[in-house]
């Protein structure tokens, strides 16, 4: 029986699968906030081998509303049949199911990064995990956006090999004594909607000429 009817939202769940710091994180939200489970259990199987409905060990009887599936969901070619059960004590309050295709449903959260401003360039240090599984690379491109005085420039650095370890990119040929803001995000080849990081801004220090001009006054 399909319970996807739009007007029936009582205890239904909203699921989201995200690649966060190159870990597959499934999160969920209950539409009816009057139902408060004491704990959840997450189960899944793959559509091509449905017999084995498996409880996710670190998401059995959990009080969290998310689950790290990095070590469970490895294939971008499989459909994952997912079941979330909500409990109050020993009573099963609800069962929500959803089918996921990682290649289609995954959203890519931006990596952590820091910026350091110099007179005419900015060092952008992007933090990737030290080891990233091959399956979780997803044909992603790193995009660094530079914004200043209403002008946005996109930089697509070429990363040799895997996106792993720390990566530094230099945005050069900048104007001293100017405010620049930087955002980073991961872009997928399928033109999915991107999630941009919040902007980080820096006012570049003045250049040598303006410094000497200042000291001459």
């Amino acid at each position: 029986i399909s319970y996807d009817s739009p007007d029936y939202t009582d205890e239904s769940c909203t699921f989201k699968i995200s690649l966060r710091n190159f870990r597959s994180i499934l999160s969920w939200e209950l539409k009816n906030h009057s139902i408060v489970p004491t704990h959840y259990t997450l189960l899944y199987t793959i559509m091509s081998k449905p017999e084995d409905l498996k409880v996710v060990k670190n998401c059995a009887n959990t009080t969290r509303s998310f689950c790290d599936l990095t070590d469970e969901w490895r294939s971008t070619h499989e459909a994952y049949v997912t079941v979330l059960e909500g409990f109050s004590g020993n009573t099963t309050l609800f069962s929500c199911s959803h089918n996921f295709w990682l290649a289609i449903d995954m959203s890519f959260e931006p990596p952590e990064f820091e910026i350091v401003g110099f007179t005419n360039h900015i060092n952008v240090m992007v933090k990737f995990p030290s080891i990233v599984e091959e399956e979780l690379q997803f044909d992603l491109s790193l995009v660094i956006e530079e914004q200043s005085e209403g002008i946005v420039k996109k930089h697509k650095p070429e990363i040799k090999g895997n996106m792993s370890g720390n990566f530094t990119y230099i945005i050069d040929k900048l104007i001293p004594n100017t405010n620049y803001c930087v955002s980073v995000y991961l872009e997928h080849s399928d033109e999915q909607a991107v999630i941009k990081s919040p902007l980080k801004c820096t006012l570049l220090p003045p250049g040598q000429e303006s410094e000497s001009a200042e000291s001459a006054k």
Epitope: S2, Y3, C13, T82, V83, H98
Partner: nanobody, 122 residues
């Protein structure tokens, strides 16, 4: 609360008809559902299965006599049983699972009801 509640069982003469119902609550998303039965001293036997898209399958001995259907709005699963035979006597159970049909679906279905007794006399 997650529940499957069967009703509609009873006693009937051979050749008669019964309509079983199964009221589902607490399920959200897409589930396939089915009916299986168990007679005293016998193994569980699959009867009929319906996918979330409405496609159906039946055990060979019930094809043409039994019809499975569902009402999505009311969240009720039905089993219309015609031309009943004494060998159809059993407890009939409703089951639900997020997985589409597979060979051992009836044995492995995650959710099941308490059952309703059907007795067919000759």
């Amino acid at each position: 609360q997650v529940q499957l509640q069967e009703s509609g069982g009873g006693s009937v003469q051979a050749g008669g008809s019964l309509r079983l119902s199964c009221a589902a609550s607490g399920f959200y998303g897409t589930y396939s559902m089915g009916w299986f039965r168990q007679a005293p001293g016998k193994e569980r036997e699959g009867v009929a299965h319906i996918e979330s898209d409405g496609s159906t399958r039946y055990a060979d001995s019930m094809k043409g006599r039994f019809t499975v259907s569902k009402d999505n709005a009311k969240k009720i699963l039905y089993l219309q049983m015609n031309s009943l035979k004494p060998e159809d006597t059993a407890v009939y159970y409703c089951a639900a699972d997020p997985r589409p049909y597979f060979r051992t679906w009836y044995e492995r279905a995650r959710y099941g009801g308490q059952g309703t007794q059907v007795t067919v006399s000759s």
